[in-house]
Amino acid sequence: MKVLQEPTCVSDYMSISTCEWKMNGPTNCSTELRLLYQLVFLLSEAHTCIPENNGGAGCVCHLLMDDVVSADNYTLDLWAGQQLLWKGSFKPSEHVKPRAPGNLTVHTNVSDTLLLTWSNPYPPDNYLYNHLTYAVNIWSENDPADFRIYNVTYLEPSLRIAASTLKSGISYRARVRAWAQCYNTTWSEWSPSTKWHNSYREPFEQH
């Protein structure tokens, strides 16, 4: 039994890191393998993660971690019984994928303005809480070409757009994702989408 693709890990910079790897053949990850991990810290202890299958030869492990700080470094040991298959390390702050925003809501009762709000996925004491920026994706269910991205570079988790920038009388969907420039993170997954019917009063045309 050998590792074909070494484990690569990403952290949500809060409490979970996800590691994925591939073996050289079909493997029952949960029965044959264990990923041991430990924070390099005087008061830490070793933990064991039981991996799950992720395709025939692929394995994935969700590591429960202490609150992350930038200096953290974890040792990782992948075992098959008594055999050490791979040894490595992982700095969560260097491989961050933020959590997805939640509670996306479209408020359509503000005159002819659409107000989209969502929740920051981090608690106020987490470093990323004040460092997230967002991308909002709005698209038409009727017209695949009607697809747009709004970059929200301020900290407030909201976006205002004129309803008239979208077509009236049809349904739209929106979703939002996050990233943090400070740690050069990847984008989060998209939030669940929310749907609304866009309607507004056309301006009176004078002839």
Epitope: S15, V40, F41, L42, L43, S44, E45, M65, D66, D67, V69, S70, A71, D72, P123, P124, D125
Partner: antibody, heavy 115, light 109 residues
């Protein structure tokens, strides 16, 4: 807002015992290492003890064998049991959250050791 | 055990002046594990700088940290009245634990 609220200081005779408490709020207590740091009157800061999220502990040589740090994650609380107290243990004791450094501190509680 | 020595013991300056505080370690310290604190009379210490040069949340940008190896510096670019206090450096070591310097008092001249 992260808060650490301390209680349990007071006057004790040499050789006596005292238990300090620290209640945390505004953060996930169970995912953070916790510490005690003290400051003798007019002196500098001295690290006393620390406890990891899994219960691993460490002590300064000056208190080893006399002090015991513990935590109750269900109550978001940190404790320091101090036995065989000496005159040199007299100080303001601070609880703190942290790891390699201490990012949040309690208000401090004075422990006076005097006959 | 790593010993941290701060200098000077006392720094007498006027508001608006630049303050430079030194922290020297008896052996090499990882920059990731070097921090600075401010303490005012009757108050708990407050984290200013961690990782030798990163400002903690809410700390004004007049505070900056630098250095590596055995020599570290805290600089206050322009002293405000509220900056007069005692400053401590602190390091963490995987075997020896946590140690503080003896402190530098920044007082009004």
């Amino acid at each position: 807002e992260v808060q650490l609220v301390q209680s349990g200081g007071g006057l004790v005779h040499p050789g006596g015992s005292l238990r300090l408490s620290c209640a945390g709020s505004g953060f996930t207590f169970s995912r953070n290492a916790m510490f005690w740091v003290r400051q003798a009157p007019g002196k500098g800061l001295e690290w006393v003890s620390g406890i990891g999220t899994g219960g691993a502990t460490s002590y300064a040589d000056s208190v080893k064998g006399r002090f015991t740090i513990s935590r109750d994650n269900a109550k978001n609380s940190l404790y320091l049991q101090m036995n065989s107290l000496r005159a040199e243990d007299m100080a303001v004791y601070y609880c703190a959250r942290g790891r390699y450094y201490f990012d949040y501190w309690g208000q401090g509680t004075l422990v006076t050791v005097s006959s | 055990e790593i010993v941290l020595t701060q200098s000077p013991g006392t720094l007498s300056l006027s508001p608006g002046e630049r303050a430079t505080l030194s922290c020297r370690a008896s052996q090499s310290v990882s920059s990731s594990y070097l921090a600075w604190y401010q303490q005012k009379p009757g108050q708990a210490p407050r984290l200013l700088i961690y990782g030798a040069s990163s400002r903690a949340t809410g700390i004004p940008d007049r505070f900056s940290g630098s250095g590596s190896g055995t020599d570290f510096t805290l600089t206050i670019s322009r002293l405000e009245p509220e900056d007069f206090a005692v400053y401590y450096c602190q390091q963490y070591d995987h075997s020896a634990g946590w140690t503080f310097g003896q402190g530098t008092k920044v007082e009004i001249k």
